[in-house]
């Protein structure tokens, strides 16, 4: 080896990913929100609607005090990779209804997978366990019908919508303990 | 500039122990996960140890397990390795390495060998 | 035998565009791990050269890409250079051991 010699310094550092992070979360809860909401123009939802195959809402507002980094981290990435799966099947197998919407799903897949970049990076940097989802993935049929692909957009989209809004909440609460 | 300065490496009979040590400079240490990575004279990287940005995860290869322990001290910006029951094979340049590993230090050579 | 698998040697002539490939499994690069890259030059630390499957760190220059497909992950190196000369190291995050496994290296060398 050679003698000492320093390195310069790479384009972020965990904080900064962090930051990063945060900005790509609230940019795509954004684009989440205004899909969501063309959905409910085009095809007005009768009710809530719910998808067995989405994973569960990891938090709630009482439980933001206590959250650790690692958990949050990992429990945000697991969830995220699940809608990621389901913005993908939708893509693929939603039929000509969807088709409507294909740009700004693209853009919505996109955007999920730099995010799912990001935290990756963040965990690496931390060097925090980052086990891949131990939950077997469920297989994803194709939709009953042109309804039933249309209220599994309208899950997806609400699912993902409120996974996020606690995600900002949670990493904001984390920066400060970084 | 980050900088990274092991020391500790030298020669050591098979059975023995040495501890090393990685001084860090230039970078918020307490913010990074930091690894230790060997190589064997002509050969290619092998990723030992990694320990978390605050301490509380440690995890090490199987080649390892049970002989090194990885340690930090966050008020001193150091990371440690401590090698019992050194073999032969464990004769490498041993880097101290931060991140993803983004930052690798020049590195240690430890010998065993009687 | 490593875990992410190379080949053992490259070469190009100067101005050529060289790639290298490191393929993995559906544990690691498969799984949706990122692929980091790392460049040593003789007798020197390795440095790190594309992270996050092809992003450069401030300082490389952007002859040096990175991609990403499947299980397998590869490095290109356009307008090729003497000072290429290096031993190139892919690197991906491995669930099963909470730590980075690296390939076996590629020599490069540039005619």
């Known amino acids: 080896p050679g003698p000492p010699a320093g390195s310069p310094r790479v384009s972020s550092d965990p904080r900064a990913d962090l930051d990063s992070a945060v900005l790509l979360t609230r940019s795509l809860l954004a684009d989440t929100r205004q899909l969501a909401a063309q959905m409910r123009d085009k095809f007005p939802a009768d009710g809530d609607h719910s998808l067995d195959s989405l994973p569960t809402l990891a938090m709630s507002a009482g439980t933001l005090g206590s959250l650790q980094l690692p958990g949050v981290l990992t429990r945000l990435r697991v969830d995220l990779m699940s809608y990621l799966r389901h913005v993908q099947w939708l893509r693929r197998a939603g039929g000509p209804s969807l088709k409507t919407l294909e740009p700004e799903l693209g853009a919505l897949q996109a955007r999920l997978e730099r995010l799912l970049r990001r935290l990756q990076l963040l965990m690496s940097r931390l060097a925090l366990p980052q086990a891949a989802p131990d939950q077997p993935v469920i297989p994803l049929g194709p939709p009953a019908s042109a309804w039933g692909s249309i209220r599994a957009a309208h899950a997806i989209l609400g699912g993902l919508h409120l996974t996020l809004d606690w995600a900002v909440r949670g990493l904001l609460l984390l920066k400060t303990r970084l | 500039e980050v900088q990274l300065l092991e020391s500790g490496g030298g020669l050591v009979q098979p059975g023995g122990s040495l501890r090393l040590s990685c001084a860090a400079s230039g970078f918020t240490f307490s913010s990074y996960g930091m690894h230790w990575v060997r190589q064997a004279p002509g050969k290619g990287l092998e990723w030992v140890s990694v320990i978390s940005y605050d301490g509380s995860y440690k995890y090490y290869a199987d080649s390892v397990k049970g002989r090194f322990t990885i340690s930090r001290d966050n008020s001193k910006n150091t990371l440690y390795l401590q090698m019992n029951s050194l073999r032969a094979e464990d004769t490498a340049v041993y880097y101290c390495?931060?991140?993803?590993?983004?930052?690798w230090g020049q590195g240690t050579l430890v010998t065993v060998s009687s | 035998q490593s875990v992410l698998t190379q080949p053992p040697s490259a070469s190009g002539t100067p101005g050529q565009r060289v790639t290298i490939s490191c393929t993995g499994s559906s544990s690691n690069i498969g799984a949706g791990y990122d692929v980091h890259w790392y460049q040593q030059l003789p007798g020197t630390a390795p440095k790190l050269l594309i992270y996050?499957?092809?992003e450069r760190p401030s300082g490389v220059p952007d002859r040096f890409s990175g991609s990403k497909s499947g299980t397998s992950a590869s490095l290109a190196i356009s307008g090729l250079r003497s000072e290429d000369e290096a031993d190139y190291y892919c690197?991906?995050?491995?669930?099963?051991?909470?730590?980075?496994?690296f390939g076996g290296g590629t020599k490069l060398t540039v005619l």
């Open positions: 390495a931060a991140g993803v590993p983004d930052y």
């Open positions: 690197a991906a995050w491995d669930p099963s051991l909470n730590g980075p496994v």
């Open positions: 996050s499957n092809n």
